[in-house]
Interface confidence: low
């Protein structure tokens, strides 16, 4: 009984820019080849349980097969590598989830308001939908101090946990990061006293 996977798909956590091409490889372990009396030409690739056309598949050597997708558009695809063994019985070798989306846009229109004696709320426009898990972090500093980062829950605003110091200019910007890239907004510089919201 083979308890370990019969092989692996690389990359193991594929994230692809939507509209681009993508190639994955499946590498069979030597023990698997011998156990099932197969080689890489016996590999069947599947996406969401449907067989991938043979013209997208290349047998590289006896252990390795590759599959290429052009113009990837689906946000999430289950990609599996399978082998046809004894009398066409299909055995799953390995599976990965292929995600597609966009790198984050540069956040724009960053603005902040101060709730006197409490906290500061900053908001921004994140740009187009990325279709991927994207983290937005509000960063701030001034000449002699780095303030704590603020992790945005919604991707469009963040309430900072510190009370900003008045009468000194602070610098604030937003960083956006996902598996396809990292970018920041332009920084804004202001004295928090000028951003106090009238009560």
């Amino acid at each position: 009984q083979l308890l370990e996977p019969c092989g692996y798909i690389y990359p193991e956590f594929p994230v692809v820019q939507r509209g681009s091409n993508f190639t994955a490889i499946c590498v069979l372990k030597e023990a698997c080849l011998q156990h099932y009396y197969v080689n890489a030409s016996y590999i069947v690739w599947k996406t969401n349980h449907a067989a991938v056309p043979r013209e997208q598949v290349t047998v590289i050597n006896r252990t390795t097969s590759s599959v290429t997708f052009t113009d990837v558009v689906l946000p999430s695809v289950q990609l599996t590598c399978n082998i046809l063994s004894f009398g066409q019985i299909e055995q799953n070798v390995y599976g990965v989830t292929m995600l597609s989306g966009f790198p984050p846009d540069k956040p724009t229109n960053l603005t902040c308001i101060v709730n006197e004696g409490k906290n500061m709320l900053c908001q921004w426009d994140p740009g187009r939908e990325t279709y991927l898990e994207t983290n937005y972090t509000l960063k701030s500093e001034w000449a002699t101090e780095k303030f704590p980062d603020c992790q945005s829950k919604h991707g469009t605003s963040c309430m900072v946990s510190y009370m900003p110091t008045y009468y000194v200019n602070i610098e604030v910007w937003v960083e956006a990061e996902n598996a396809l890239g990292k970018v920041s907004s332009e920084s804004i510089n202001f004295d928090p006293v000028d951003k106090v919201k009238p009560t």
Epitope: W142, E171, L180
Partner: nanobody, 124 residues
Framework: QVQLQESGGGLVQPGGSLRLSCAAS?????TYWMYWVRQAPGKGPEW???????????YYADSVKGRFTISRDNAKNTVYLQMNSLKPEDTAVYYC?????????????????TGQGTQVTVSS
């Protein structure tokens, strides 16, 4: 005239150290994020490191993380790159650049560097 002048490069043995400097003139360094970008012979430019305006937020390419340290002295209008544990693959011309914001540029998007740069050669 806006200018960035790199210096401090040289020939060093593997495992050695160098400190690069970039002096800005014609503009106030503290209003810009600063970057180091390198270009090896026959290769495209590679983003190495970035430092925020105040100097508290620093970023590094995976290939140099833990070995290089970027810093800045806004009073002296200078940005530095301390390079330790140098490897032959660090051999390149190093350029400093400025920007109004931070970009973790992917490999195919690094802007082509301009200026002289400073040559770093790591060889035994």
């Amino acid at each position: 005239q806006v200018q960035l002048q790199e210096s401090g490069g040289g020939l060093v043995q593997p495992g050695g150290s160098l400190r690069l400097s970039c002096a800005a003139s014609g503009f106030t360094l503290s209003t810009y994020w600063m970057y180091w970008v390198r270009q090896a012979p026959g290769k495209g430019p590679e983003w190495v490191s970035a430092v925020s305006r105040g100097g508290f937020n620093t970023y590094y390419a995976d290939s140099v993380k833990g070995r290089f340290t970027i810093s800045r002295d806004n009073a002296k209008n200078t940005v530095y790159l301390q390079m330790n544990s140098l490897k032959p693959e660090d051999t390149a011309v190093y350029y400093c650049m400025s920007s109004v914001s931070f970009y973790g540029w992917p490999p195919d998007r690094v802007p082509s560097p301009t200026g002289q740069g400073t040559q770093v050669t790591v060889s035994s």
